[in-house]
């Protein structure tokens, strides 16, 4: 499929000008290659009319130009003094005309309307309001006022001052007669339809002395704004319909076959299942404008979108609308990353978030998508050291591996963590990605004690048992704080006896805290990594208390406190479930790897409807030793 994009149809009138914008992926090669505008012949060729290399056909001499905007990835063809001969099929493209890197454009130039003398032309957008002004003389001040529409050869009464209203205009038309000082009446038509366009005649009086005025009403269907975005990227539709519809329900819909327009999202709470987790409707301003953001763009998202206002929250005849034609460029600069990450309850996930590598200094954010109230995304963690209180000790955002990717680790998973999360930065807003976390059944990999109590001034040793499957991975202990997890020295104690059917490659790695102080209290994580790619983690809360009896503490799994909701195994080991599906590069041997398929079927893990304040549920005070 060609990555070139432009307007499918361009309509104009004889004597006018058009400006046609064509989009291309702004790679270095594309920015500098030839751009052209050619006319398609009946036998399939395409004859160049103008190109970026300076060629201008004699047909276009003095009335056309082509300008390249390499920084935007666009070029613009301007054509003036249009005639009906210019109607036809064209291509805008890159390189050689026959190469296929092009987009088909249909140009339709029509004759200007043949208007009667003294005809007032009203040009109004679909769904808006028009006021047709009708002057009259004093002798007709007391006589009947009327507005007719020319249908074929016959004038059809639309409205008159005796109270008649044509059924096609019921509820959306009125006739106003100005005060005695002004010899003028006006007809106001709201919620204009395409079918309202045409020739009108207003009249004061019915005899030969009546005053008449011709009006030509042109109702414009909005030209779609062209939007060119990358696959897996995001798009923002800014919808400004005017203050007159500030209090009317708003919608965004996508045109399907024919005139149908399927609601994508509206302010009445409707949302299409295909957009679950990847759409947010920003609340409207006082002037009634609003915006809709869609992330994780898919090929099938391409098409025509309309935003509008109607009490039903969907497109109806006479809705004021704005239109966009979205093209999804499959030659995307945004790398693939898992759209679904699975983790076992009690375990952890490590989510990779892509960002524009030119913006390495931007602030990175990770937020929880909430579908209620048209969508919010409350911040959970950022790269500046802020962590939502309910997530202390179990959530960390790491700048690693860097170079266009950051990592978010969430551990102590519960079923309430299932849901959609967004990766954002304060830089390039096109780089917003969505990941769904699913909580699955399974067994843990890492085994650590429950909450541990250390004694001031003594030595504490905390074990972490790694199964043999992690033999080739780097094993670490770190102390969590709101800016990350600071690595600590640890000791390899040899093979672990905590696993059945696991050979000598299993490992017991201990964290030793010498001469414990109050500052040692807090969350500690053990985990695995490979270079800068993080795998599973398990968390332990270490509480510090006053000395009771001398000596050092060597915490075994059996002696550790079993926290609520965690199972104690028959062997005496307490197991914190800790299997997570991570970056496929890390855990290629695992069967269920992060699922990168688009989840358009609506089969997603359920998210508790509790508020975001309740999410998490694993903050420090829950884990103190009593």
């Amino acid at each position: 499929k060609s990555p070139i994009f432009g307007p499918e149809e361009v309509n104009s009138v004889e004597g006018n000008s058009v400006s046609i914008t064509c989009y291309y992926p702004p790679t270095s090669v594309n920015r500098h290659t030839r751009k052209y505008w050619c006319r398609q012949g009946a036998r399939g060729g395409c004859i160049t009319l103008i190109s970026s290399e300076g060629y201008v056909s004699s047909k276009y001499a003095g009335r056309a130009n082509l300008t390249n905007f390499p920084e935007n990835g666009t070029f613009v063809v301007n054509i003036a003094q249009l005639s009906q001969d210019d109607s036809g099929r064209y291509k805008c493209g890159l390189g050689i005309n026959s190469r296929g890197l092009s987009f088909d454009v249909s140009l339709e130039v029509s004759q200007g309307p043949g208007l009667l003398n003294d005809t007032k032309v009203y040009t109004v957008d679909l769904g808006r309001t028009v006021t047709i002004n009708c002057p009259f003389k004093t002798e007709n001040a007391q006589k009947r006022k009327s507005l007719y529409k020319q249908i074929g050869l016959y004038p059809v009464l639309v409205i008159d001052s005796s109270g008649y209203v044509n059924p096609n205009y019921t509820g959306r038309i009125r006739l106003d007669i100005q005060g005695t000082g002004q010899l003028l009446f006006s007809v106001v038509i709201n919620q204009l339809r395409l079918s309202d366009a045409g020739q009108y005649l207003c009249q004061a009086g019915d005899d030969s002395n009546s005053n008449k005025k011709n009006a030509d009403l042109q109702v414009l269907k909005p030209e779609p704004e062209l939007v060119y975005e990358d696959l897996r990227g995001s798009v923002t539709f800014h919808c400004a319909l005017g203050p007159e519809v500030a209090n009317v329900a708003k919608f965004l819909c996508r045109q399907s076959s024919g005139e149908n327009c399927d609601v994508v999202v509206n302010t009445l709470g409707k949302r299409a299942p295909a957009f679950e987790g990847r759409i947010l409707l920003n609340p409207q301003d006082k002037d009634g404008s609003f915006s809709v953001v869609i992330t994780g763009l898919r090929k099938e998202d391409a098409g025509r979108y309309l935003c509008g206002a109607h009490s039903d929250g969907q497109l109806q005849e006479g809705s004021p609308i704005q239109a966009w034609q979205l093209f999804v460029n499959e030659e995307s600069t945004i790398p693939r990353s898992p759209t679904v990450v699975k983790g076992v309850a009690g375990s952890s996930v490590a989510v990779l978030c892509p960002y524009n590598r030119k913006e390495s200094k931007s602030i990175k954010y990770w937020c929880l998508w909430e579908g209620a109230q048209n969508g919010r995304c409350p911040l959970l963690v950022d790269s500046e050291g802020w962590v939502k209180a309910q997530y202390e000790g179990r959530l960390s955002l790491l700048e690693e591996p860097g170079n266009g990717t950051f990592t978010v680790i969430l551990n102590q998973l519960t079923s309430r963590d299932a849901g959609f999360y967004w990766c954002l930065t304060n830089g390039d807003t096109l780089w917003r990605t969505t990941v769904e976390i699913k909580i699955i059944e399974g067994e843990p990999n890492l085994k650590v004690p429950g909450n541990v109590t250390a004694v001031l001034g003594e030595t504490l040793k905390v074990p972490c048992h790694f199964p043999c499957k992690f033999s080739s991975y780097e094993k670490y202990w770190c102390k969590w704080n709101n800016t990350g997890c600071q690595a600590l020295p640890s000791q390899d104690e040899g093979p672990s006896k905590a696993f059945v059917n696991c050979d000598e490659n299993s490992r017991l790695v201990s964290l030793t805290l010498n001469l414990v102080t109050r500052a040692d209290e807090g969350w500690y994580w053990c985990g695995v990594k490979q270079g800068h790619f993080y795998g599973e983690t398990a968390a332990v809360y270490v509480a510090v208390e006053e000395r009771k009896a001398a000596g050092s503490r060597d915490v075994s799994l059996a002696k550790a406190d079993a926290a609520p909701d965690e199972k104690v195994l028959d062997s005496g080991f307490r197991e914190i479930e800790n299997k997570a599906i991570q970056d496929p590069r890390l855990f290629a041997e695992e069967k269920a790897v992060a699922d990168t398929r688009d989840q358009a079927d609506g089969s997603r893990a359920s998210v508790d409807s509790g508020s975001s304040e309740e999410q998490g549920g694993s903050s420090r005070h829950h884990h103190h030793h009593h």
Epitope: N282, C377, G385
Partner: nanobody, 131 residues
């Protein structure tokens, strides 16, 4: 809701120092940025300094860089503004402001220097610098 109470204002000579405090109470777990703004009579309210509540990154208006220092004590839910080398042009009402963590996409675009980014405001404390 978050309530903010400023203190520490007063009348000083040019070149002197002053330390303003702002104590936050209420739902302080939602705090994201805290900042100081000032408003001289007949002037617009202007940004002075801000601090990120998590990592402590600081932001300053060019006019106070090198003279003013913003700091925080998370345990006390308090933010401070240490003002050194005060000038008569620093005379104004000083307001403490708090911003909660972003929730809507537009929130993420707002900068700590923007007055519109802040959700909660104190009553202000007067600082007068005489020459």
């Amino acid at each position: 809701q978050v309530q903010l109470v400023e203190s520490g204002g007063g009348l000083v000579q040019a070149g002197d120092s002053l330390r303003l405090s702002c104590a936050a109470s209420g739902r302080t777990s939602s705090l994201y940025n805290m900042g100081w703004f000032r408003q001289a009579p007949g002037q617009e309210r202007e940004f002075v300094a801000a601090i990120h509540w998590g990592g402590g990154r600081t932001y300053y208006a060019d006019s106070v860089k090198g003279r003013f220092t913003i700091s925080r004590d998370n345990a006390k839910n308090t933010v401070y503004l240490q003002m050194n080398s005060l000038e008569p042009g620093d005379t104004a009402n000083y307001y403490c402001a708090a911003r909660r963590a972003p929730e809507l996409l537009d929130d993420y675009k707002q900068k700590p220097e923007e007055i519109g980014a802040y959700h909660y405001w104190g009553q202000g404390t007067q600082v007068t610098v005489s020459s």
